[in-house]
Amino acid sequence: CKAMHVAQPAVVLASSRGIASFVCEYASPGKATEVRVTVLRQADSQVTEVCAATYMMGNELTFLDDSICTGTSSGNQVNLTIQGLRAMDTGLYICKVELMYPPPYYLGIGNGTQIYVIDPEPCPDSDF
């Protein structure tokens, strides 16, 4: 395993529909053909996996059908979108990139993107 630099934005504001997008960019030290991207949420000292996808270079990311994440890849950049976010999901979202194949294995951990989610105000009832 060798360490690899991963960059991601410091702050992102989710849309009113609870969607947040950010770019995760990694400085690939080798010619990887298979890459694993994981989004982790860190709250206090708890780390949980939000979603993960493995993709072949040049192909699209494939998340599980029930995943709240979608994404596209372009070279050493991954464009990640997280859906269905609510105010309680506000937190630090860390991008982890692993070059899985061929060996050697490389690991990169981003510093995290603070995603702020604000629940939309309910529409007031109107008498018409």
Partner: antibody, heavy 119, light 107 residues
């Protein structure tokens, strides 16, 4: 809750083989890198080997390369360590450990299984 | 391979003391460092990862600092149950080497 239970240790003669197993439960086994760490009697901790997710990627300490093979069966949630050409210096407690989500540190450990290589 | 050197190898301190253990890497490892506690006859326990992040459930008297080559584990107020051997471990690249350990005793 996360549980790691090792088995397969015992007394074995130099040059012989042994296979250790680690049964995992309480987490999604295939989502984690898994490791073996050993500790000789009265000594410190020594990392032995790692195997990633689907089992294709592995890494070993120089002290065991060519003699020890790590493998996993994700359908059985089980990690293995095949030890060949055993030497007296392989005598140790062998721990199965789960790698962390943020890197290959070890957030959960099994209770360990003792391997004694002696004639 | 990168070597990890801990100091001191053993130390004795009184209950309530502030205790510091250092770990030095022979090359820079960014913040890819973990600390473990191993009580006599017990399994190692993760205390800190990423040099300074406290593992869930670990008492707040434990803290970690450092980056690059020099790292520190601090116990702000030593308790009797802290008697153990403490290990650092680097995980930036394989092999994931441990320090030789620091044995902590109560005076």
């Amino acid at each position: 809750q996360v549980q790691l239970v090792e088995s397969g240790g015992g007394v074995v003669q130099p040059g012989r083989s042994l296979r250790l197993s680690c049964a995992a439960s309480g987490f999604t086994f295939s989502s984690y890198g898994m490791h073996w760490v050993r500790q000789a009697p009265g000594k410190g901790l020594e990392w032995v080997a790692v195997i990633w997710y689907d089992g294709r990627n592995k890494d070993y300490a120089d002290s065991v390369k060519g003699r020890i093979t790590i493998s996993r069966d994700n359908s059985k949630n089980t990690l293995y360590l095949q030890m060949n050409s055993l030497r007296a210096e392989d005598t140790a407690v062998y721990y199965c450990a789960r790698g962390g989500l943020l890197g290959p540190y070890f957030d959960y450990w099994g209770q360990g299984t003792l391997v004694t290589v002696s004639s | 391979d990168i070597q990890m050197t801990q100091s001191p190898s053993s130390l004795s301190a009184s209950v309530g003391d502030r205790v510091t253990i250092t770990c030095r890497a022979s090359q820079g490892i960014s913040n890819y460092l973990a600390w473990y506690q191993q009580k006599p006859g017990k399994v190692p326990k993760l205390l800190i990862y990423a040099a300074s992040t406290l593992q869930s459930g670990v008492p707040s008297r434990f803290s970690g600092s450092g980056s690059g080559t020099d790292f520190t584990l601090t116990i702000s107020s030593l308790q009797p149950e802290d008697v153990a051997t403490y290990y650092c471990q680097k995980y930036n690249s394989a092999p994931y080497t441990f320090g030789q350990g620091t044995k902590l005793e109560i005076k």
